[in-house]
């Protein structure tokens, strides 16, 4: 985990100021609205499942 | 230093009810989504309940045996959930982890907490 | 509901070898970008523990002995070289939609 400021989160993860961590990519498809997701925006959308 | 911490549990009669507890610290409880995860020699590893983050309006899901049975809710403010359990079954019989997720992955578990329904 | 099939059941591997466990999903679990796949260890009277999230993605603090692979339906869990405290039963999950469902398990004895 990377703290702001410092080197960019790893591949596949983006900052969430919310949770104060590099959070991955891939659970955007569960919860789009995570304010991480915005630095995501390189993957293609997927379906959200229930 | 993340923890979840259980308690309930013990033996009861089939047809009772039983409720577990689990106290959360140690991460944004708030915006994790929290789950009951049973497992018994018989089914293994099975996901019981999911309630969602207020961001999700808490929405629930359950596993399709527990459905009518089982009540899972939680409590934000004071970083803890719960599952509510009537008309328990001999085949409910297992350990009971609680677990957070943000989403996906059941990333931190509690101890376990046995529950045995028997006469 | 997607059935999570974990070969072999128990395997023995000699200490500093190879640990192979397999997992095949009954539909595909997989997006063009990302596998909902994940891997967990479970050590007798202790919760489950996660591996590798997303089929790939090391656990923080999982030492990189462990490693996933695997798209769609078929997935992989090695370990390389095994070492003593490797012995655990070893599940794998996925998150491709309600309900999760997890494999049977694969039991790892160290020889």
């Known amino acids: 985990e990377q703290a702001p400021g410092t080197a960019p989160c790893s591949r596949g993860s983006s900052w969430s100021a919310d949770l104060d961590k590099c959070m991955a990519c891939a659970s955007c498809r569960a919860r789009p609205h995570s304010d991480f997701c915005l630095g995501c925006a390189a993957a293609p959308p997927a379906p959200f499942r229930l | 230093q993340v923890q979840l911490q259980q308690s309930g549990g013990g033996l009861v009669q089939p047809g009772g009810s039983m409720k577990l507890s689990c106290i959360a610290s140690?991460?944004?409880?708030?915006?994790?989504?929290m789950s009951w995860v049973r497992q018994s020699p018989e089914k293994g590893l099975e996901w019981v309940a999911e309630i969602r983050s207020k961001s999700d309006n808490y929405a629930t899901h359950y596993a399709e045996s527990v459905k009518g049975k089982f009540t899972i809710s939680r409590d934000d403010s004071k970083s803890r959930f719960f599952l509510q359990m009537n008309n328990l079954r001999a085949e409910d019989t297992g350990i009971y982890y609680c677990?957070?997720?943000?989403?996906?992955?059941?990333?931190?578990w509690g101890q376990g907490t046995d529950l045995t329904v028997s006469s | 509901d997607i059935v999570m099939t974990q070969t072999p059941a128990s395997l023995a591997v000699s200490l500093g070898q190879r640990a192979t466990i397999s997992c095949r999903a009954s539909q595909s679990v997989s997006t063009s970008t990302y596998s909902y796949m994940h891997w967990y260890q479970q050590k007798p009277g202790q919760p489950p523990k996660l591996l590798i999230k997303?089929?790939?993605s090391l656990e923080s603090g999982v030492p990189a002995r462990f490693s996933g692979s695997g798209s769609g339906t078929d997935f992989t869990l090695n370990i390389h070289p095994v070492e003593e405290d490797d012995t655990a039963t070893y599940y794998c999950q996925h998150s491709w939609e309600i309900p999760y469902t997890f494999g049977g398990g694969t039991k790892l004895e160290i020889k």
């Open positions: 140690g991460f944004t409880f708030s915006s994790y989504w």
């Open positions: 677990s957070s997720t943000y989403a996906d992955y059941f990333h931190y």
């Open positions: 997303y089929a790939s």
